[in-house]
Interface confidence: low
């Protein structure tokens, strides 16, 4: 029998640094935990203790944080190159910056394959992109070979940047001619590692002939057996087995998300190529475990230049913003208005002659506004200021909902009215009248919504029956400030970008600003 | 702290092919946060990258010198080499190794040089 | 290949004075460039990384600024070990190419 060791991560979004343990800020150094220089200490201690060992990632390294913003992936790059890291597959992320913004930091300066098979280019770019990215990989291990295979998410286009010389199939459908292929080589190990989510990895298992181990990405799930170390709930077992259509066992993993946790997994395999066994966890990557001194001290290094970053100037306001809590937690608010036009514009994607766009509506807790922006500043705003503001370091995410759902959402909004709690909602996209003069839970009187398939948009009734997409923080996805009918009743979740850096990309595009109350909420007495 | 030294001959003839290693003390090539690069200046004139190598082998070649360049590893040695076939008397140049950190690819630490002479 | 093009390519300053060198790239490299100061006779030694980060161990005299296609090395009061010259390096795209130089002399 012959062991593979496999090591993986998923989903870090730029927590270069070590974060605290909820994937924010550090603020107490002892607690904190993740980041790439404590990551090194772990994967450098298994490679001198284990013979056959792999470091893979499955993708949406970009986007998260500062230092993705200013380095747009050239940290990426240099650090995963610096820990040594075998392959990797794209992630929907790793187009938020366009085609360019991927080949020339990340794929061109990559020391690793970074692989994805149902990604297809044409046009001029398919000459351009060449080689650049693969759909598999052989690699020797010891005196084996292992073939690595990728895959994205299909929902690529509509979460990300791609442009229009990328195709992107369907993952099955892609992935078995290559792993075919694979078999023609005489490779009998074969590693499907790819980010479209954790029911997609799952079919790959039980679909594709010949893929051994699924390595995920995408949904941020944790798996664990036993007692889990950390906060977060497990899925499932690690690694989850599927029983494949042909009869095999196949394990699956995805190690949650940020650099929290390294995945850590142990495959037996016969002479044969098939799989005798695996087991593992994922490893827990707390204070316990020393930051690399090498490692931080480049940390260090690169960081000089995001604290300089932050004070500059973004673009201006030459309005006040308000985003105190007695305005965005009672009515509608600018600030409000503000951080939702630029959520929706984030997430402008003209796919479908059909749609001006495929999402008009978002929707954001009041009590996640946390500072107003004062424009007597000389009306600066800085990544500093918006901060402030965003201080939770959360994403903007693309939902799924029925109808019924955001009614119910927008009744939570208003259920305890006038205690300043933080589910009042502010709105893109969305005109809502509230009555509060009728019983909790009945208090949306008008709910109007902005149509996408459409080439003039205007305001119609909201359908209860209806699927809508909606722009969201993750917060609220994950049934935040009481909103768990969002959690509970969704239909999809994609998670977006990081607040603040969809919020200074829109104020540095539009240069200044000056968004105002124009009644997308208002309230009301009386009969309608 | 890490020093790289150039060797090799001082003259070669045209249409030979010159040969140059340089030794990295004081750290390892196996550092993967950087890899190693071949430079050289003509007398008199600016600076030309010839190439780069990763500590697992990856090269890459400047195009105006691909067809006559090989640079190797040998991680056993703390070694990389340069090899330049067919050489005229334009590649007479002060030859420069150097380690370039990845990301920027800012060039960190330098050899002192060694003086490439192609003459008959 | 991008094209790296400095200016002036020589210059005369004495002790004390500002200075400030141009490297101009032929198309958008962002903020990867990198500037050298060559001695005669010696390596070059890196300054600035990044367009405008100064490298450890670099008096603070010494500053790089600039993205797209305009970068500048601007050194605040020249002092006698300054007399140089200085190359530019774009690390953008492949190969990677340096400017011509520009050679600080004492006037």
């Known amino acids: 029998a012959w062991e593979l060791t496999i090591l993986h991560t998923n989903d870090v979004h730029s927590r270069l640094e070590q974060t605290s343990e909820d994937s924010s800020k550090c603020v107490n150094a002892s607690r904190c935990m993740g980041g790439v220089a404590r990551l090194f200490t772990k994967v450098q201690q298994i490679r001198r203790a284990e013979p056959n060992v792999l470091l893979l990632d499955a993708g949406d390294q970009y986007q998260g944080t500062i230092w993705f913003t200013v380095y747009k992936g050239a940290e990426v790059a240099h650090f995963m190159n610096a820990l040594r890291y075998d392959a990797m597959a794209l992630g929907n992320h790793e187009f938020d910056n366009g085609v360019e913004g991927l080949i020339e930091p990340l794929l061109k300066e990559a020391k690793f394959p970074i692989l994805s098979a149902n990604i297809k280019a044409k046009g001029p770019l398919a000459s351009q992109i060449s080689g650049l990215y693969l759909p598999y990989k052989v690699l020797p291990v010891g005196d084996e070979v292992v073939g690595i295979v990728g895959y994205t998410s299909k929902e690529t286009p509509f979460l990300s940047n791609p442009g229009t010389n990328l195709v992107f199939e369907d993952e099955i459908t892609a992935l078995q001619p290559e792993v075919d292929k694979l078999k023609t080589l005489n490779v009998n190990k074969i590693i499907a590692l790819g980010h479209s989510g954790f029911e997609m990895d799952k079919l790959i298992a039980q679909k594709v002939r010949g893929v051994d181990v699924v390595v995920g990405g995408h949904s941020n799930t944790f798996l664990y057996t036993g007692n889990p170390p950390s906060k977060e709930v497990p899925a499932g077992k690690y690694p989850f087995i599927v029983t494949s259509d042909d009869g095999r066992k196949v394990p699956v993993v995805q190690a949650y998300a940020f650099g929290k946790y390294l995945g850590y997994l142990k495959i037996e395999f016969d002479e044969r190529g098939n799989v005798i066994s695996s087991h593992g966890n994922p490893i827990l990557l707390n204070s316990s475990i020393p930051e690399d001194p090498s490692i931080k001290a480049d940390i260090n290094k690169w960081r000089i230049k995001l604290d300089n970053y932050s004070t500059q100037e973004l673009g201006k306001t030459i309005v006040y913003l308000d985003g105190s809590s007695q305005s965005c937690r009672f009515r509608e608010c600018n600030m409000g208005n503000l951080i939702c036009d630029a959520m929706i514009n984030n997430n402008l994607r003209h796919t479908d002659e059909m749609f001006w766009n495929h999402v008009s509506m978002c929707i954001l807790n009041g009590g996640g506004i946390r500072s107003p922006i004062d424009e007597r500043n000389n009306g600066t705003i800085t990544w500093e200021n918006l901060a402030a503001v965003l201080p939770f370091g959360g994403t903007f995410d693309l939902v799924q909902l029925k109808g019924s759902t955001l009614k119910k959402a927008f009744e939570h909004s208003v259920h305890r009215y006038g205690q300043s709690t933080g589910e009042f909602l502010q709105v893109g996209g969305i005109h809502v009248v509230y009555d509060l003069s009728r019983k909790p839970g009945d208090r949306v009187v008008k709910l109007d919504v902005l149509c996408t398939k459409c080439r003039v948009p205007s305001y119609d009734p909201l359908k209860m029956d209806e699927v809508y997409k909606v722009i969201l923080p993750n917060f609220l996805a994950n049934g935040g400030d009481g909103f768990q009918m969002i959690k509970d009743e969704l239909l999809r979740h994609d998670s977006g970008d990081q607040d603040i850096n969809v919020v200074s990309t829109y104020i540095s595009k539009m240069k200044v600003i000056y968004p105002a109350v124009e009644g997308r909420i208002k309230f009301s007495t009386g009969s309608h | 702290q890490l020093q790289l030294q150039e060797s090799g001959p001082g003259l070669v003839k045209p249409s030979e092919t010159l040969s140059l290693t340089c030794t990295v003390s004081?750290?390892?090539?196996?550092?993967?946060?950087?890899?190693w690069v071949w430079i050289r200046q003509p007398p008199g004139k600016g600076l030309e990258w010839i190439g780069s190598?990763?500590?697992?082998?990856?090269?890459d070649y400047n195009p105006s010198l691909k067809s006559r360049v090989t640079i190797s590893v040998d991680t056993s040695k703390n070694q990389f080499s340069l090899k330049l076939s067919s050489v005229t008397a334009a590649d007479t140049a002060v030859y420069y190794c150097?380690?370039?950190?990845?990301?920027?690819?800012?060039?960190?630490?330098w050899g002192q040089g060694t003086m490439v002479t192609v003459s008959s | 290949d991008i094209q790296m093009t400095q200016s002036p390519s020589s210059l005369s300053a004495s002790v004390g004075d500002r200075v400030t060198i141009t490297c101009r790239a032929s198309q958008s490299i962002n903020s990867y460039l990198n500037w050298y100061q060559q001695k005669p006779g010696k390596a070059p030694k890196l300054l600035i990384y990044?367009?405008?980060s100064l490298q450890s161990g670099v008096p603070s005299r010494f500053s790089g600024s600039g993205s797209g296609t305009d970068f500048t090395l601007t050194i605040s009061s020249l002092q006698p070990e300054d007399f140089a010259t200085y190359y530019c390096q774009q690390a953008y795209a492949r190969p990677r190419t340096f400017g011509g130089g520009t050679k600080v002399e004492i006037k």
């Open positions: 990044a367009a405008s």
């Open positions: 190598i990763y500590y697992s082998g990856g090269t």
């Open positions: 150097a380690r370039v950190m990845s990301g920027w690819l800012d060039l960190d630490v």
């Open positions: 004081g750290g390892s090539i196996l550092s993967s946060s950087y890899y």
